[in-house]
């Protein structure tokens, strides 16, 4: 706290508020009889800038010229030092350094809508640190002038509150902004414009869309605009897209026909307006209209595949599978699939509509030539049917692809490769690669996946519905006319040693040897494709290494004979399973003693 200046005065010239870079003159003078008591020439006046001495003088007054002060406030204090006493405060001064306003730049004015008011913005330039008064002046025809002031440190916008009208759209108006503070003033360059230059139309409103006869090819967009609008631009895009389609239209009078919309697609539409071909600015975009285009009948054809399963001497089970049409092919909500099954020689046909599934299973006689046709229907019609002749897909041995292999290819992908069949490879019309999770029971409910490959391809990357640590049964079919050949292999995308070994459920004696039966390892514990089982045995209470027998893994096999056991010796037996990654832990242990005679 600086005491009021009882002992002396500080005067400041030219002012307490000065321009950056200028000099200030500070004078400190003692009032009469306020110096040191005995000898006035012992008076030592000291000037401090904050806490640092910058000048001193013996006598009744001190004069100091100060330069180089920074922006903002600097505190000066004048003190008196007498012999054998502390310094006494005389008086203080704060000097504030600011800058004169820079020339306001980029003055631009706008009137939002035909009924709006003229408002201008500008760039202030460097912060002055001082109260700066901005005066905005607008002059028009017939010596009309308008003026508006704003008294704020950070002013860069003013609204005149007046409305320019289109009576004389080519009349010139000139705007200028002047900034004044206690350190100086500056004016912008004048900005000259006409009504058409500065009126920015309001965005269009009341946007609607109509589809004549519920057809996507007869679509009209309607909207409302201010009266003087000449130009519009429309932009639209499917709701799931980031790219806009853009259309410019002149004298649209609030409507425009759109010809390239896709059916059954949600679109977002926006419109902007402008008063003149090359003057003025575009309005903001309107609020979005979202609308779904009508359905059209599906295009494209379903990808259909099938499986045959022998039931008995007279019957077979046919399972049909098909893939959904893509959105662009479905062109609407698929309501049902129509499946037609026909015996080609007798002409008998049955048709069924399937909803909610992409598969169908039926039982047909093993005799006769059968064909199926499958199509997809939406509210507007059906796709062209996909026709397939039901044949024995693996009958032609010479058409079987050779050297089929399946290798892991990164996360959840399997690369299947093969060689063309021995029979004339050029006869192959296409390959089909089919895969499904391996289930020991051959469960037909397990989903089937397939992809088609061109006849010159000898590999396919399968990634759809592939999970880690699951074994897949993979078949490669070569199709030629009404014949087919196939080869199969097991494959996985990722594997590790099985989590458990097989569970031995029975050991039986047969003619001096034993038959071991086991339960399959649960699929979720196999951790990939099993390559082998191992059966281990050793004499009970013996420390010798166990003997083992390795059996190649076959899906349906769950028993195996062993004939190298000695009669009347008690053995301990157990099993493990192996994938390419390693061997499982032991399964359960069983003891067995062969009763028969030794050979």
């Amino acid at each position: 706290k600086i005491d009021a200046c009882k002992r002396g005065d500080v005067t400041v010239k030219p002012s307490h508020v000065i321009l950056l870079g200028s000099t200030v003159n500070i004078t400190c003078s003692l009032k009469p009889r306020q110096g040191c008591f005995h000898y006035s020439r012992r008076n030592k006046l000291i000037l401090y800038k904050f806490d640092r001495r910058i000048n001193f003088h013996h006598g009744h007054s001190l004069n100091s010229q100060v330069t180089g002060l920074p922006l903002g406030t600097t505190l000066f204090v004048c003190k008196l030092a007498c012999i054998n006493s502390d310094e006494i405060q005389i008086c203080g001064a704060e000097i504030f350094v600011g800058v004169a306003p820079e020339q306001p730049q980029n003055l631009s004015c706008i009137q939002k809508g035909e009924q709006g008011t003229v408002a201008c913005t500008w760039e202030r330039g460097r912060d002055t640190h001082l109260y700066t008064e901005y005066t905005l002046q607008l002059s028009g025809p017939k010596n009309l002038t308008w003026q508006k002031q704003c008294k704020d440190i950070y002013c860069d916008y003013l609204d005149f509150g007046i409305n320019l009208t289109p009576e004389s759209p080519e009349s010139n108006f000139t705007a200028k902004v002047t900034a004044v503070n206690s350190l100086g003033s500056s004016s912008s360059l004048p900005s000259t414009f006409t009504f058409l230059d500065i009126v920015r139309p309001l965005p269009p409103w009341d946007i609607r869309i109509k589809f004549q006869k519920a057809s996507v090819s007869r679509c009209t967009l309607y909207w409302r605009d201010e009266g003087l609008v000449l130009l519009n631009r429309l932009r639209y895009r499917p709701s799931n897209s980031r790219l806009w389609n853009m259309v410019n239209v002149t004298k649209a009078k609030g409507r425009h026909d759109l010809l390239d919309l896709k059916p059954f697609t949600e679109y977002e539409f926006q419109i902007s307006s402008k008063l003149h071909l090359y003057k003025g600015s575009w309005s903001d975009w309107s609020e979005s209209l979202r609308a779904q285009t009508p359905e059209e009948e599906p295009t494209g054809m379903l990808d259909v595949w099938y499986m045959k399963r022998h039931i008995d001497y007279s019957r077979q089970q046919i399972s049909l599978f098909w893939k959904n049409l893509s959105v662009s092919e479905a062109r609407g909500k698929i309501l049902h699939y129509q499946v037609t099954l026909q015996e080609l020689t007798g002409g008998k046909a049955m048709t069924q509509n399937i909803t909610g599934h992409t598969s169908w299973t039926t039982v047909i006689p093993r005799t006769g030539n059968w064909a199926v046709a499958v199509s997809a229907a939406n509210s507007k019609g059906s796709s062209l049917p996909t026709r397939i002749n039901i044949m024995n897909l693996c009958e032609a041995g010479l058409l079987a692809p050779r050297q089929v292999s399946a290798n892991s290819e990164g996360m959840d992908n399997i690369l299947v490769t093969w060689q063309p069949p021995r029979k004339d490879p050029s006869a192959v019309q296409e390959y089909v690669v089919e895969w499904r999770e391996l289930h020991p029971g051959g469960d037909t409910q397990v989903p089937l996946n397939w992809l088609r490959s061109r006849p010159y391809n000898v590999s396919a990357l399968i990634s759809e519905n592939i999970k880690s640590y699951i074994c897949y049964e993979i078949r490669v079919y070569a199709l030629s006319g009404d014949q087919g050949g196939c080869s199969s292999i097991l494959g996985n995308s990722k594997h590790k040693a099985p989590l458990s070994g097989p569970h031995i459920n029975a050991i039986t004696e047969e003619k001096g040897s034993i038959l071991i039966s086991w339960n399959s390892i649960p699929v979720q514990e196999q951790m990939g494709c099993l390559l082998h089982y191992r059966i281990y045995w050793k004499e009970r209470d013996s420390n010798s290494q166990p003997q083992l027998c390795e059996i190649p893994y076959r899906v349906s096999q769950n028993s195996h004979p062993i004939n190298s056991l000695q009669p009347r010796v008690t053995y301990v037996l157990w099993m493990t399973a192996l994938t390419a990654a390693g061997e499982s832990s032991h399964g359960n242990e069983r003891e067995f003693c062969l009763q028969g005679k030794a050979n």
Partner: nanobody
Framework: QVQLQESGGGLVQAGGSLVLSCAAS????????MSWYRQAPGKQRELVAE???????TYADSVEGRFTISRDNAKNIVDLQMNSLKPEDTAVYYC?????????????WGRGTQLTVSS
Amino acid sequence: QVQLQESGGGLVQAGGSLVLSCAASGSAALIFLMSWYRQAPGKQRELVAEVSRYGSTTYADSVEGRFTISRDNAKNIVDLQMNSLKPEDTAVYYCKADQYYGDSLRSSWGRGTQLTVSS
């Protein structure tokens, strides 16, 4: 922002004396500088005298030795004691307060009081 009310103007004979007073109300905290300006008809507004919150002063050359500015920080009042008045001192006298506003100064002005010095 601060509101300023000037008082004390009027008609005075040349050579006479008068005191102008200015009272600050509202958010009068941190008033850095209180000043008197004047504007004669047809002329620019000019600084007469100013006083900082620490008591330092500045005077225009034309009034130095005749006018004295003083300030009561507690009451937020600034007085301008005018002696040896001359006809050229005739003007509207405005009170101004500069307040800190962040690292900037924000100014407030009074509406002014008329001083007429007759010869």
